[in-house]
């Protein structure tokens, strides 16, 4: 049978549990015939504090006075050392250093729900470092008392397991908590309360929302509450918002009308409850209800723009473009756009519903006066139509904005500036700045962007759909009644030297001069707006500097004549392209020998 102290004892005076700062006397004594075998004077008793030797003595017992022990547990071990043998463990003792409990503070009690049980919390104060038992006492009317003990390491909460009922809501109850350990005890100040003070209702449940006649303006929130609830507070917000709208209601009886919700918006709703105007506490917020409000017919009007393209002597192509309504204007899912095209004099009208696009192209005669109307429709109705008379937007030269410039403005922005037209500037009703990626061949499928500017503005920052190293064709229109004037410019937000030069695809001889033709540089290699092409030539096998001819860049141009070559001399020719950032590398080299006579 194992006995940790069969050879002797360790005694501690005055107690194993001491107040911080106290002194203890530790005695280690051997039991009879448990010393060293030969001569008792050879007994060497050693006292250890944890693993550190603090005292020793020859004989059957050892006394040691110990001071300055820290808070917590200290282990003392007594060992016997005999000559020519290992130390033998005699016995050990724990000494527990702590303090008496402080007075528990801020005792407060709560009953969660009318059917819940009373539970109290308090602040323990500083750690006693000892086992401290807490006893919670509750006394009520008719000398009723309840008591509960807490035996956990850290105790600052106890549930009585009893339920206060609303029979006499004004009856007083008093709670008190007492902390006890080996060094003392302390009680909190009493906390007195009534049923109404401490019952915290359960959060509302079964929250629902109803929209009468599927209308956002006739919306009622329903919920269920415990029976005694008098007050509610509602909070709600769009799901993408951080700010709550708050409403306080009295005697709502589980329903409330909401009047300020936006259509076609997902909202989050929560409700909290209270039993009394100024007593007790609010419940936790209910679980969230998420619900989408019904659609309403769109408000606002579409921003519509158009492009005209000449097809032949009798026909023209009209491309209409419009911007999506904002979420707050659409007030629902836009199902289609209705486009109506009408010849104003003859009265012929054509209506078409467009789904999935924000553009429409048609071909109309070049004669007659044409107008379009475009509106957006959701399940509840249509927006007011935007009406536009189709005119030649650039016809009035005197309305053309002057001195148009386009400059890079930070990352992926272009600042467009202009001067008002020469014609009475006050006649301008608005400016429209239009931009689209420059594509040789003027591809009408390229997306069109535009913004409207007030008549007193002479600049606009364009940033939508602007990419670095892409050249944009920018037009500024001045509109006045049924007239328009325009000016255009090329611009980019960021540029560098083109990645390649033009590819010469043909050199032909015409009356003593040559005509060079080339393929355009692919758009993705232009790296911005091209300013010039350069054609270089030199005699083959010559070390002289090449001659060059610089041609201003024009979108549609892809050939140029040179008439300064000598006949019957073989030349090497190549081309480069330039942006404002620099010159490209050489394109391909072609050799050519002019056959005709020199001029």
């Amino acid at each position: 049978k194992i006995d940790a102290c069969k050879r002797g004892d360790v005694t501690v005076k005055p107690s194993h549990v001491i107040l911080l700062g106290s002194t203890v006397n530790i005695t280690c004594s051997l039991k009879p015939r448990q010393g060293c075998f030969h001569y008792s004077r050879r007994n060497k008793l050693i006292l250890y504090k944890f693993d550190r030797r603090i005292n020793f003595h020859h004989g059957h017992s050892l006394n040691s006075q110990v001071t300055g022990l820290p808070l917590g547990t200290t282990l003392f071990v007594c060992k016997l050392a005999c000559i020519n043998s290992d130390e033998i463990q005699i016995c050990g003792a724990e000494i527990f250093v702590g303090v008496a409990p402080e007075q528990p503070q801020n005792l407060s009690c709560i009953q969660k729900g009318e059917q819940g049980t009373v539970a109290c919390t308090w602040e323990r104060g500083r750690d006693t470092h000892l086992y401290t038992e807490y006893t919670l006492q509750l006394s009520g009317p008719k000398n009723l008392t309840w008591q509960k003990q807490c035996k956990d390491i850290y105790c600052d909460y106890l549930d009585f397991g009893i339920n206060l009922t609303p029979e006499s809501p004004e009856s007083n109850f008093t709670a008190k908590v007492t902390a006890v350990n080996s060094l003392g005890s302390s009680s909190s100040l009493p906390s007195t309360f009534t049923f109404l003070d401490i019952v915290r209702p359960l959060p509302p449940w079964d929250i629902r929302i109803k929209f009468q006649k599927a209308s956002v303006s006739r919306c009622t929130l329903y919920w269920r509450d415990e029976g005694l609830v008098l007050l509610n507070r509602l909070r709600y917000r769009p799901s993408n918002s951080r700010l709550w709208n708050m409403v306080n209601v009295t005697k709502a009886k589980g329903r409330h009308d909401l009047l300020d919700l936006k259509p076609f918006t997902e909202y989050e709703f929560q409700i909290s409850s209270k039993l009394h105007l100024y007593k007790g506490s609010w419940s936790d917020w209910s679980e969230s209800l998420r619900a989408q409000t019904p659609e309403e017919e769109p408000t606002g009007m579409l921003d519509v723009w158009y492009m005209k393209r000449h097809i032949d002597y009798s026909r023209q192509q009209i491309s209409l473009f419009w911007k999506n309504l904002s979420v707050s204007e659409a007030r629902g899912k836009i199902l289609h756009y209705q486009v109506t095209l009408q010849e104003l004099t003859g009265g012929k009208a054509m209506t078409q519903n467009i789904t999935g696009h924000t553009s429409w192209t048609t071909v109309i005669p070049r004669t007659g006066n044409w107008a379009v109307a475009v509106s957006a429709a959701n399940s509840k109705g249509s927006s007011l139509p935007t009406r536009i008379n189709i005119m030649n937007l650039c016809e009035a030269g005197l309305l053309a904005p002057r001195q148009v410039s386009a400059n890079s403005e930070g990352m992926d922005n272009i600042l467009v500036t202009w001067q008002p037209p020469r014609k009475d500037p006050s006649a301008v009703q608005e400016y429209v700045v239009e931009w689209r990626e420059l594509h040789p061949g003027g591809d009408t499928q390229v997306p069109l962007n535009w913004l409207r500017s007030r008549p007193y503005n002479v600049s606009a920052l364009i940033s939508e759909n602007i990419k670095s190293y892409i050249c944009y064709e920018i037009r500024v229109y001045a509109l006045s009644g049924d007239q328009g004037g325009c000016s255009s410019i090329l611009g980019n937000s960021k540029h560098k030297a083109p990645l390649s030069g033009p590819h010469i695809n043909a050199i032909t001889e015409e009356k003593g001069s040559i005509l060079i033709s080339w393929n355009s540089i692919p758009v993705q290699e232009q790296m911005g707006c091209l300013l010039h092409y350069r054609i270089y030539w030199k005699e083959r096998d010559s070390n002289s500097q090449p001659q060059l001819c610089e041609i201003p860049y024009r979108v549609s141009q892809n050939s140029h004549p040179i008439n300064s070559l000598q006949p019957r001399v073989t030349y090497v020719l190549w081309m480069t392209a330039l942006t404002a950032a620099g010159e490209s590398s050489h394109g391909n080299e072609r050799e050519f020998c002019l056959q005709g006579k020199a001029n």
Epitope: I2, A4, V77, G92, F96, L130, Y131, I153, S182
Partner: nanobody, 125 residues
Amino acid sequence: QVQLQESGGGLVQPGGSLRLSCAASRRTFSKHAMAWFRQAPGKEREFVAVVRWSGIITYYADSVKGRFTISRDDAKNTVYLQMDSLKPEDTAVYYCAAGDYRGNGYYVPGMYDYWGQGTQVTVSS
């Protein structure tokens, strides 16, 4: 997370002996106080014995002093309860517990963080 597994329970006649074992899953075992508690039907869980500091310190409930011996083998992460001179009133489910009691709270179940599932000891003729 320390897991504790008791074994060794069973039916024994009054005056007989049993040896309970409790194996711990982690080597942090040696840092903890290891205790045995028991719970008879309809009664609260009560302290039986505890061993701490690799066996230097032991405490026993008055009702078992001189009959039961607690010991531990830190190399095997195991604590033992040798029960001799068993009486019918020793009948209970015996639980092994590990933790670090504070002050003189070694006898309080709430001081211990980890518990085994328990093993039944029945003392009956």
